[in-house]
């Protein structure tokens, strides 16, 4: 957890999601007329988002403390989770209601249905992730996390089946991390990058998180990461070796969640 | 489509003032500002300033100011720009361009361009 | 004001090259919230400026992704990934964080 422009931010809430992203004027927050929002979300190439692809942005992930106007006339914001100080402790999508006054000043939500999404939050039993635009290279300045939570008991086999980033030797420019928890603080298993295949995870819980990060210069191919359900029935979840087995490495027992 | 559509070619005496305009059509007029550059061969591009047609407020380059006085007529969605005591250092092309400047995008789409041509 | 520098003047590439122009600024261009305003326009022989690149890195509305750019602070750069003929003409950088808002020299893309 922690604080990010002011609003209390945990990674698992995501900065854009099913074509919905938040902007603000360049002054700051709170400063656009309706007018101004249609205009800042029209630039971009899309266009005011309504209430229903706020709240379906909402459902996968979509978090922002901060309100801002919709599609005719509307204002409000989306809330995953509730907290003292933002969204009276409820979640959904906090409405303000359709502004009689159009001079109101607030943020804006946007939905482009064309913009190169990432991310999200993942319950299907398996799953292909790809760099934004794979199999074309991946963009400068992007930021992607990809969230699994399967069922209690559960655990998650990743595999690379492409990958090439730019390579450094500490991996600071662009790079790929797993965690073996639901967010990007607790369990870390490793940053890669360059275009070696990294060895199969298997997490020790029911939840994993992928970050991607690329910089402002450098991009590669980008990659292809699968992920596949262990059952705890099966026998590669019984294994309780930490080291590297084979192509797979075993993490030891730590995260389980609900 | 966003549209920009210039005034065409002036000529002008030295000392005189010139009134260019730009008509908009394609996006809500009032929604952006409307931001004016000179273009002289060999010295790149100059901004001149913008103005914002929902409430007329104006931005200048300082060496532009008193020289330039912009204008707009909503009804019409039309921009203009009056130049004033041109001398031959004001010849050449203006150009008007969409802007918006509370969102810190610069300017996307421009007109055709207006070229101006100062002699006695 | 900030003068914007941008190099080279001249930048002749052959057809599915990789061709790099550099903007420099005399100060940051990062405003007190964190934000850098600097785009990035291809003009053709005869025509207007079209804008290619927003706020740094951001491609504009219907540009191809061969168009990147990149940096912060004073330092920034157009990259176009595979030169194609439509590619040609002059490029040239504005940064809209303070005013007066100031141009890029230019640099002209030309076949080698």
């Known amino acids: 957890w922690g604080f990010k422009n002011g609003i209390f931010h945990n990674s698992i809430w995501l900065e854009q999601a099913a074509g919905v992203y938040h902007r603000e004027a360049r002054a700051g927050r709170y400063k656009l007329t309706y007018a101004e929002a249609k205009a800042v979300c029209e630039f971009e190439g899309g266009r005011l988002a309504t209430y229903k692809q706020l709240e379906a942005a909402r459902k996968i992930g979509f978090h922002v403390c901060a309100a801002g106007w919709m599609a005719k006339g509307r204002v409000g914001y989306p809330i995953v989770k509730p907290g003292p100080n933002c969204g009276f402790g409820k979640t959904g999508i906090i409405d303000y209601g359709i502004r009689l006054n159009r001079s109101e000043r607030w943020d804006a939500y946007c939905y482009n249905p064309h913009a190169k999404e990432c991310g999200g939050v993942f319950t299907d039993p398996k799953r292909i992730f790809k760099s934004p635009g794979f199999p074309n290279e991946y963009d400068d300045n992007q930021v992607c996390y990809w969230h699994i939570r399967l069922k209690y008991g559960q655990r998650i086999h990743l595999s690379f089946l492409d990958f090439d980033l730019e390579h450094d030797p500490g991996c600071l420019a662009d790079y790929v991390e797993i965690y073996d928890s639901y967010d990007d603080v607790h369990g870390f298993v490793g940053r890669y990058c360059g275009d070696e295949l990294p060895e199969d995870i298997i997490s020790t819980g029911n939840v994993m998180t992928l970050k991607f990060l690329s910089d402002a210069s450098v991009t590669a191919g980008g990659f292809q990461i699968k992920y596949v359900t262990v059952d705890p029935a099966s026998k590669s979840s019984q294994a309780k070796n930490t080291s590297t087995t084979g192509n797979k490495k075993f993490l030891p027992g730590r995260f389980s969640h609900l | 489509q966003v549209q920009l559509q210039q005034s065409g070619p002036e000529l002008v005496k030295p000392g005189a003032s010139v009134k260019l305009s730009c008509k908009t059509s394609?996006?809500?007029?009032?929604?952006?500002?409307i931001n004016w550059v000179k273009q002289r061969p060999g010295q790149g591009l100059e901004w001149i300033g913008w103005?914002?047609?929902?409430?007329?407020?104006?931005k200048f380059n300082e060496k532009f100011k008193g020289m330039a006085t912009l204008t707009v007529d909503t009804s019409s969605s039309t921009a203009y720009m009056e130049l004033h005591s041109l001398t031959s250092e004001d010849s050449t092309v203006y150009f008007c361009?969409?802007?918006?400047?509370?969102?810190?995008?610069?300017?996307?789409?421009w007109g055709q361009g207006t070229s101006v041509t100062v002699s006695s | 004001d900030a003068v914007m520098t941008q190099t080279p003047l001249s930048l002749p590439v052959s057809l599915g090259d990789q061709a790099s122009i550099s903007c420099r600024s005399t100060?940051?261009?990062?405003?007190?919230?964190?934000?850098?305003?600097l785009n990035w326009y291809l003009q053709k022989p005869g025509q207007s400026p079209q804008l290619l690149i927003y706020r740094v890195s951001n491609r504009f509305s219907g540009v191809l992704d061969r168009f990147s750019g990149s940096g912060s602070g004073t330092d920034f750069t157009l990259k176009i990934s595979r030169v194609e003929a439509e590619d040609l003409g002059v490029y040239f950088c504005?940064?809209?964080?303070?005013?007066?808002?100031?141009f890029g020299g230019g640099t002209k893309l030309e076949i080698k």
């Open positions: 103005i914002y047609p929902s409430d007329g407020s104006t």
């Open positions: 504005l940064q809209v964080t303070h005013v007066p808002y100031t």
């Open positions: 394609g996006y809500t007029f009032t929604s952006y500002d």
């Open positions: 100060q940051s261009l990062e405003d007190s919230n964190g934000n850098t305003y």
């Open positions: 361009a969409r802007g918006l400047w509370y969102y810190g995008g610069g300017v996307d789409y």
